[in-house]
């Protein structure tokens, strides 16, 4: 590197760094699709934002590629459960690449909150939060799904998220 | 940008990246209050730190503005619980700002903890986990509540805990 | 700090920046091996990686010291329970120094899963994540401890998984 | 000030059943756990069981399970126990005790509700 | 269920004097660090009264003179100087597992 060259760099490091890229978005009424997607999430009004990712269907996609901390929590409760007490819940972040056809999954949640809920009728809250970090590339997306999506609740943005940003 | 205000500017980088702001604060005898006032935590003995950002009555306080990953774990437990299996947790990160005369509601998880005990065996624990980015200008302020307090257990500050770092 | 002296500490900040410390370790079915050590992890294959972090013998091991955020999942599971529904699970992320003979515990969860089991459907599930910022310095390690072991579930590395990078 | 007063002594047949209430005042009711506890004579304190006032969510003493019933009126600020089947150890002062803030204690009691069971 | 042992069963005190209660669990009591042990006052016709809660918490209104100790399975009631109206029957309880349970009762009466 001649020193000229090692200028440009840290001029442009300088000014990526100014955008590291982050993002956090925010449930919504019309997160819960019923349709068997993913999550869908709110990126701009109130505590949503995105700097240096983009936003598409659910999914945050990756401009620079790199390791990113990626997370998500959802609120989860009801009145009693679909299934009964027997009620499981995945929660899970996973991958989308033009290279494969699937989704990959990358950090994943199994709970079982309905063994709080003791008779039908019985109200109950629980939380599930994963957080890890992953190598995306530029172009990959990044979805939120959670199984069974009717145990979701959702109100104001603060119970149920999804973010990252770039470590 | 000339290059010799780029190069204060990069020296000012270089140095403030050196003490890029981060805190981890940890629970304590004290931390209760029983007052309806937020959590209160230690800030210098044992894991605590203050890095970059300050400490008041409960209060981590920003000095820089910018994205900061915020995050809160609380330590649940008890014998039996006061309200039965309806007695419901709310923990959450809460936002002052002189902007505003209300706390803003940043991060915030509810759980119903109790069906964790059973029939003889009245002991039960549990723990609620929250981490997000949130947007935040020079003095302004992020505290932890929980609601109901008595269900938080202290004991060497490794078990209940509140941090911040700007992403 | 003259000219020279500080664009060489910029150059190599650059180049550190690069590789800034982080670290993701997944479950594997050689995780657990009921010898009361901690956890083992993947380092390499799927989502597992190590950069400018190593691995030895379940623990992460520092190369630069500073201030880390560390974190852990744990998914836990089972058919009832080895001590019933009274059953205790401590999840918890220790520090091994040599300035020091024991291990000291930085980050601990402690849960009773098993409530979620009940009289029909004995099946459940839960899960266990923490993390937090902590100081290491070079040669300490960290590694995750599960105390019953035997009701963590290991699948495909997505479950349960430890991880740090540098704040 | 926080008041628990309990409904008069009660004389019942063998096989009968008896209702005894405990009106609560003072306090946010729905906010404390209420216990029931009895006192045969020349005999000690015996827990019975308590009463979430909040749900109605019931925890019964095992030795009392099928045969007693604690139920709540949130619209009176009561709890009653109701105890069937009656046999002559039944013969007890019967007392509604409120759980403390932390719950695990009984800070307040009522004055007690003698119940004899006499053929 | 947990089994709760008083001793004596009976204590004569003077006046003025210190009187120490025992009771014995058949299990530990303890939870984080604290005890599910609960001292209770009764006399004649009256219901019980709540004296020490968390093995060693003086509950308000109460006198000083009374404090708990003790962890585990074993707990001490002490009153440090007897007054005429601190003669009455005393109570242990355990509330970490149900069913609570009582002990038997120490009756204090005057020498």
């Known amino acids: 590197d001649g020193p000229a060259g090692s200028w440009e760099q840290l001029i442009q490091e300088r000014r990526s760094h100014e955008v590291n890229p982050a993002a956090h978005l925010t449930g919504a009424n019309s997160s819960l699709t019923g349709s068997g997607g993913p999550l869908l999430w709110e990126t701009q009004l109130g505590l949503a934002f995105l700097r240096g990712l983009s936003y598409h269907d659910g999914a945050l996609v990756v401009t620079k590629a790199g390791y990113y901390y990626i997370y998500s929590k959802v609120q989860l409760g009801g009145v009693g459960c679909p299934l009964g007490l027997a009620s499981t819940i995945t929660h899970g972040l996973y991958k989308r690449t033009p290279r494969y056809p699937e989704e990959l999954e990358l950090l994943v949640s199994q709970q079982s909150p309905c063994g709080r809920a003791t008779s039908s009728s019985r109200v109950w809250w629980d939380s599930s939060f994963l957080g890890g970090v992953v190598h995306l590339e530029a172009g990959e997306e990044v979805v939120v799904r959670v199984l069974d999506e009717r145990l979701v609740r959702l109100r104001d943005g603060t119970r149920s998220y999804f973010g990252a940003f770039m470590v | 940008d000339g290059p010799a205000g780029s190069w204060e500017q990069l020296i000012q980088e270089r140095r403030s990246h050196e003490v890029n702001p981060a805190a981890h604060l940890t629970g304590a005898n004290s931390s209760l209050t029983g007052s309806g006032g937020p959590l209160l935590w230690e800030t210098q003995l044992g894991l605590a730190f203050l890095r970059g950002l300050s400490y008041h009555d409960g209060a981590l306080v920003v000095t820089k503005a910018g994205y900061y990953y915020i995050y809160s774990k609380v330590q649940l437990g008890g014998v039996g619980c006061p309200l039965g299996l309806a007695s419901t947790i709310t923990h959450g990160l809460y936002k002052r700002t002189p902007r505003y005369p209300e706390e803003l509601e940043l991060l915030v998880s509810q759980q119903s903890p109790c069906g964790r005990a059973t029939s003889s065996s009245r002991v039960w624990w549990d723990s609620s986990f929250l981490g997000g980015v949130v947007h935040l200008e020079a003095g302004e302020e992020v505290v932890v509540r929980v609601l109901d307090e008595r269900l938080v257990r202290l004991r060497d500050g490794t078990r209940s805990y509140f941090g911040a770092f700007m992403v | 700090d003259g000219p020279a002296g500080s664009w060489e500490q910029l150059i190599q900040e650059r180049r550190s920046h690069e590789v800034n410390p982080a670290a993701h370790l997944t479950g594997a079915n050689s995780s657990l091996t009921g010898s009361g050590g901690p956890l083992l992890w993947e380092t390499q294959l799927g989502l597992a990686f190590l950069r400018g972090l190593s691995y030895h013998d379940g623990a992460l091991v520092v190369t630069k010291a500073g201030y880390y955020y560390i974190y852990s999942k744990v998914q836990l599971g089972g058919v009832g329970c080895p001590l019933g529904l009274a059953s205790t699970i401590t999840h918890g992320l220790y520090k091994r120094t040599p300035r020091y003979p024991e291990e000291l515990e930085l980050l601990v969860s402690q849960q009773s899963p098993c409530g979620r089991a009940t009289s029909s459907s004995r099946v459940w599930w839960d899960s266990s994540f923490l993390g937090g910022v902590v100081h290491l310095e070079a040669g300490e390690e960290v590694v995750v401890r599960v105390l019953d072991e035997r009701l963590v579930r290991l699948r495909d590395g997505t479950r349960s998984y430890f991880g740090a990078f540098m704040v | 000030q926080v008041q628990l007063v309990q409904s008069g002594a009660e004389v019942k047949k063998p096989g009968a059943s008896v209702k005894v209430s405990c009106k609560a005042s003072?306090?946010?009711?729905?906010?404390?756990?209420m216990n029931w506890v009895r006192k045969a004579p020349g005999q000690g304190l015996e827990w019975m069981g308590r009463?979430?006032?909040?749900?109605?969510?019931?925890n019964y003493n095992q030795k009392f399970m099928g045969r007693a019933t604690f139920t709540v009126d949130r619209s009176t600020s009561t709890v009653y126990m109701e105890l069937s089947s009656l046999r002559s150890e039944d013969t007890a002062v019967y007392y509604c005790g409120r759980g403390s803030y932390y719950w695990n204690a009984m800070d307040y009691w009522g004055q007690g509700t003698l119940v004899t069971v006499s053929s | 269920e947990i089994v709760m042992t008083q001793s004596p069963a009976t204590l004569s005190v003077s006046p003025g004097e210190r009187a120490t209660l025992s009771c014995k669990a058949s299990q530990s009591v303890d939870f984080d660090g604290e005890s599910y042990m609960n001292w209770y006052q009764q006399k004649p016709g009256q219901p019980p009264r709540l004296l020490i809660y968390s093995a060693s918490n003086l509950e308000s209104g109460i006198p000083a003179r009374f404090s708990g100790s003790g962890s585990g399975t074993e707990f001490t009631l002490t009153i440090s100087s007897l007054q005429s109206e601190d003669f009455a029957v005393y109570y242990c309880?355990?509330?970490?597992?149900?069913?609570?349970?009582f002990g038997q009762g120490t009756k204090l009466e005057i020498k």
């Open positions: 003072g306090y946010t009711f729905i906010d404390h756990i």
């Open positions: 009463i979430y006032p909040v749900s109605g969510e019931t």
């Open positions: 309880q355990q509330s970490i597992e149900d069913p609570w349970t």
